[in-house]
């Protein structure tokens, strides 16, 4: 399929058939006009003009937006002023606000608990499988099976700390060479990135709010992907990363650290493990190829133990196998070896949930991502409804102007690079980059953040991640600290060149602009964010796997031809943009092509037939969900319960009435009003800060 | 107390079957694998094979492997071993003697079955 | 397969003294080789596992030694109740194999 599907069907030049069209200007309230007043509130009414048109059957089928869809929505303030409050009303407003941080903090812990919850149930569901992919001899021969099964495993165990501890330890027993592991590394920095991208999906409700959040959250991916398509050639060629690394670790004077410090674990470790607690030493066993790991659970049921070394009669299956010849002997039937085996006794159980269940693994799992993902849905949906009561008016305007703004000429190129400083601080905080990046999010997709600020957090947060990894390598025991430190240090060098390639020019900044295409493309046809979530996580590092497995020549024979086919379509986009000219007439739009191969559209059509039966039923439990969540919030009684339905919103579009879906911190008062549905909104339940 | 239970003697014809037995009683007949050995006055002791009751699993010398079947009923706690083909020179005493796992030495022996192999 | 060598088939001693059995194996096996003691018309005892451990009720003035390939089987103050036949066992590898045994007559 072509790449940006939509452009060849564009009008080249709006102004032709659309009078006006360069000069209409976006419906904003003029804040000089009068208000007329009803109890004591403000309503705006708004006089607005609509410039004519020749055919609105031309603006629906063909929508010009105007407005950039990524300028940050203007945060309104709809409540009562400040200075206009008596003193109960202050007092009210005081507790309010001090509710709704209490609030907003509890729903972050819960979100950030859920996350953590969430890695744990992936690694119940997928850690086995994820482990026995690493067992596969052909990763120190084949760069690019070992990339995809970093991917896939960290995809799986939705945690890149737990894929690189068992590269750690199999680099540690000589089970992998570092050049081995180094495009697991790389697998696993593009496999972390899942998270923030599941967590987007989440704001799926709202277009606009949509585009922001998912293109926010694409930026870490694309970023990841495309330094690894740049520097694991390059990695295959001189081994950089290898050599530099094995310099810094040979430069080093060896003496173990204190451990890494845990700093939001602290935290959410006591809320956590009493929802479950994981044996994570059984998918590093797997990985090894211990065969006894397998029958082995992964939820952990007794978590104090007293170790015991004793001297056993074990079974060998040759006398090769034997400790020493000496102490080799049968019994007629099978061959008996004495081995020191450390017994261990059982002491006290773990205080989970799942720990008297005795639930097979899968199940607990399935049990663990359904109501995680539930509650992380939820926190989510709270903390963006709470954000949006709370950044109104002035305090919006400050985190705003404080967040997006650059410094002073001719400083104004430092702020990206102290972005990607507090974006490494803030991850070594956390100690994780998917917990940062996934509360980045949300502010992304509201319009706290541009995508222009979160590209650097997120790259500063890829640094921190292993900054934290280098301390924990420095923490870790004499037997593997080189070979973690080593990998701690490739990892951090990886994402410093992938910085250092797609950051410093702003021309280079491709992620930014790719993530804006696939926003853009999500928020029109919102089932291709899962479609790509599915593609470019688990569909494409399959087929490699797949097609690695069978050997070079089928890997080369399919790749190939595919990698020719995209270098193909890419420079005939490129052509078709910049120099049309060049090509001739037929090659300078995809119109030459079936439409299905160059447009959503007639896909969009036949997923519509699949989900529209699903589409009710959902929809109506979202407004009930929506009503409640209003209730318990005090929003006002104009809360937009329909704004997650698409039918109510589709359904107009079709009928010829262009719909303008109301943003998040869109005035909703002049919403309705253009609807001639005016509703002045509760004064108890609005209160402005400042 | 342990007690390994045989037959005295068996008389078979030259070209017959002979399946001795060898009962079991005062212990835990499945968690000791049990052996059975030869004995001749030309040859000592040799050892046959050995089956472990709990699994079924046999083991057998390589000289045996074709004359003699082992097996085990854990209902009864009896362990046989079935000698085919019989010739003169099958004519010794078979013992059956208890190992346990890990265990390559016999400390109880049942009293051994003389088989005569006679016309 | 392991061959276990006992090089006399004879042995003749006194009340009293002090004799000692051997046993050769024909490749190393360690320390596992055991001694049985038969009886006229009885079935073999264990007398000595892993080359020098006593079975239980076995009296001390049998010992056991060696290891690798040679083995000794020593009965200090010989009695009139050992005169018997001594075989040594190796259970090393599969097949087990015995001994031809040692009669020990007592003069």
């Known amino acids: 399929m072509a790449p940006w599907p939509e452009l060849g069907d564009a009008q080249p030049n709006p102004s032709k058939y659309l009078e006006g069209a360069t000069s209409q200007q976006p419906i904003t309230p003029d804040k000089s006009k009068e208000t007329n007043k009803t109890d004591n509130t403000e309503v705006p009414v708004t006089k607005f003009e609509l410039l004519p048109t020749y055919s609105t059957a031309t603006l629906i089928e063909e929508p010009t937006e105007v407005d950039d869809p990524w300028n940050l929505p203007t945060l309104q303030d709809s409540g009562i002023k400040w200075s206009e409050r008596d003193a109960k009303g202050k007092i009210l407003c005081v507790f309010q606000g001090i509710g709704r941080l209490i609030l907003l903090l509890g729903f972050l812990y819960f979100f950030v608990c859920s996350l953590d919850v969430l890695s744990s149930a992936f690694q119940l569901v997928g850690g086995k499988m994820a482990g026995q992919f690493f067992s596969n001899s052909s990763i120190m021969s084949n760069p690019l099976l070992g990339l995809v099964i970093g991917v896939l495993v960290t995809v799986f165990v939705q945690s890149s700390s737990t894929s690189t501890s068992i590269v750690v330890s199999m680099v540690a027993s000589s089970l992998l060479t570092v050049r081995a592991a180094i495009p697991i590394i790389m697998g696993a920095n593009i496999g972390t990135s899942i998270t923030n991208t599941i967590v987007a999906l989440m704001q799926v409700g709202d277009r606009s709010e949509f585009r922001r959040a998912f293109a926010g959250a694409t930026v870490h991916d694309f970023f990841n992907w495309l330094s690894v398509l740049v520097l694991l050639p390059v990695e295959v060629a001189t081994h950089y990363l290898e050599v530099v690394t094995q310099l810094i670790v040979e430069s080093f004077h060896f003496k173990n650290g204190e451990d890494a410090p845990d700093l939001l674990k602290v935290i959410t470790k006591p809320f956590t493990k009493l929802i479950v607690q994981l044996d994570k030493k059984v998918i590093s066993q797997i990985a090894m190829n211990d065969e006894t790991a397998k029958n082995k659970s992964l939820v952990k049921i007794w978590c104090k133990t007293f170790t015991n070394m004793t001297q056993m009669n074990v079974t060998v299956p040759s006398m090769a196998n034997c400790t020493s010849p000496s102490l080799c002997w049968t019994d007629g039937i099978q061959i008996w070896t004495m081995k020191n085996v450390t017994y261990k006794e059982n002491i006290a159980k773990c205080q989970h949930i799942f720990v008297n269940f005795h639930l097979p693994d899968l199940a607990v799992g399935i049990i663990l991502l359904i109501i995680s993902l539930l509650v992380l849905c939820g926190c989510l949906i709270m903390i963006v409804k709470i954000l949006g009561s709370v950044l109104k008016g002035q305090v919006a305007t400050v985190i705003k102007k404080t967040i997006n703004t650059d410094f002073p000429f001719p400083f104004a190129w430092l702020t990206g690079y102290l972005a990607i400083l507090v974006g490494a601080g803030m991850t070594f905080i956390v100690q994780s980059s998917s917990v940062f990046t996934s509360a980045l999010t949300p502010l992304i997709g509201i319009g706290v953040i541009t995508i222009e600020r979160a590209y650097p957090l997120t790259l500063g947060s890829n640094i921190g991640t292993t900054t934290t990894a280098i301390l924990a390598a420095l923490a870790s025991p004499g037997n593997t600290l080189r070979s973690s430190l080593q990998i701690a240090l490739c990892h951090f060098f990886f994402n410093i060149s992938g910085i250092l390639l797609w950051y410093p020019i702003p021309f280079t900044r491709l992620p930014i602009r790719m993530a804006k295409g696939l926003g853009n493309i999500s928020a029109k046809y919102r089932w291709f964010a899962i479609f790509y979530l599915i593609i470019f996580f688990f569909l494409i590092p399959l087929t490699v796997f797949g097609l690695s497995l069978a050997g070079w020549p089928v890997l080369v024979g399919v790749g190939v031809p595919v990698v020719f086919i995209i270098i193909l379509v890419l420079c005939l986009r490129l052509l078709q943009s910049r120099c049309p000219r060049v090509l001739p007439k037929k090659l300078q739009n995809w119109n030459f092509l079936p439409l299905c191969m160059h447009s959503l559209k007639p896909w969009d059509a036949v997923i519509s037939k699949f989900t529209g039966p699903f589409q009710m039923p959902c929809c109506c439990c979202c407004r009930v969900c929506c009503r409640v969540c209003c209730l318990l919030c005090g929003c006002p009684k104009c809360c937009r319960c329909s704004k997650c339905c698409q039918d109510l919103e589709e359904g107009q579009e079709a009928q010829g009435v262009p719909v303008k879906a109301p943003e998040t911190f869109d005035n909703i008062t002049i919403s309705r009003e253009a609807q001639g549905e005016v509703r002045a909104p509760d004064s108890k339940t609005e209160c402005t800060a400042l | 107390q342990v007690q390994l239970q045989q037959p005295g003697a068996e008389l078979v014809k030259p070209g017959a079957s002979v399946k001795m037995s060898c009962k079991a009683s005062g212990y835990t007949f499945t968690s000791y694998n049990m052996q059975w050995v030869k004995q001749t006055y030309g040859q000592g002791l040799e050892w046959i094979g050995a089956?472990?009751?709990?699994?079924?699993?046999?083991s057998y010398n390589q000289n045996f492997k074709v004359k003699a079947t082992l097996t085990a009923d854990k209902i009864s706690s009896t362990a046989y071993m079935q000698l085919s083909s019989l010739t003169s020179e099958d004519s010794a005493v078979y013992y059956c003697?208890?190992?346990?796992?890990?265990?390559?030495?016999?400390?109880?022996w049942g009293q051994g079955t003389l088989v005569t192999v006679s016309a | 397969d392991i061959v276990m060598t006992q090089s006399h088939k004879f042995m003749s001693t006194s009340v009293g003294d002090r004799v000692s059995i051997t046993c050769k194996a024909s490749?190393?096996?360690?320390?596992?080789v055991v001694w049985y003691q038969q009886k006229p018309g009885q079935f073999p005892k264990l007398l000595i596992y892993w080359a020098s451990t006593r079975h239980a009720g076995v009296p001390d003035r049998f010992t056991g030694s060696g290891s690798g390939t040679d083995f000794t089987l020593t009965i200090s103050n010989v009695q009139s109740e050992d005169l018997a036949d001594y075989f040594c066992?190796?259970?090393?590898?599969?097949?087990?194999?015995f001994g031809s045994g040692t009669k020990l007559e007592i003069k």
């Open positions: 089956i472990s009751p709990g699994s079924g699993e046999t």
């Open positions: 066992q190796q259970f090393r590898s599969i097949p087990l194999t």
């Open positions: 490749q190393d096996v360690g320390h596992a």
């Open positions: 003697a208890r190992a346990a796992r890990a265990e390559g030495w016999f400390a109880y």
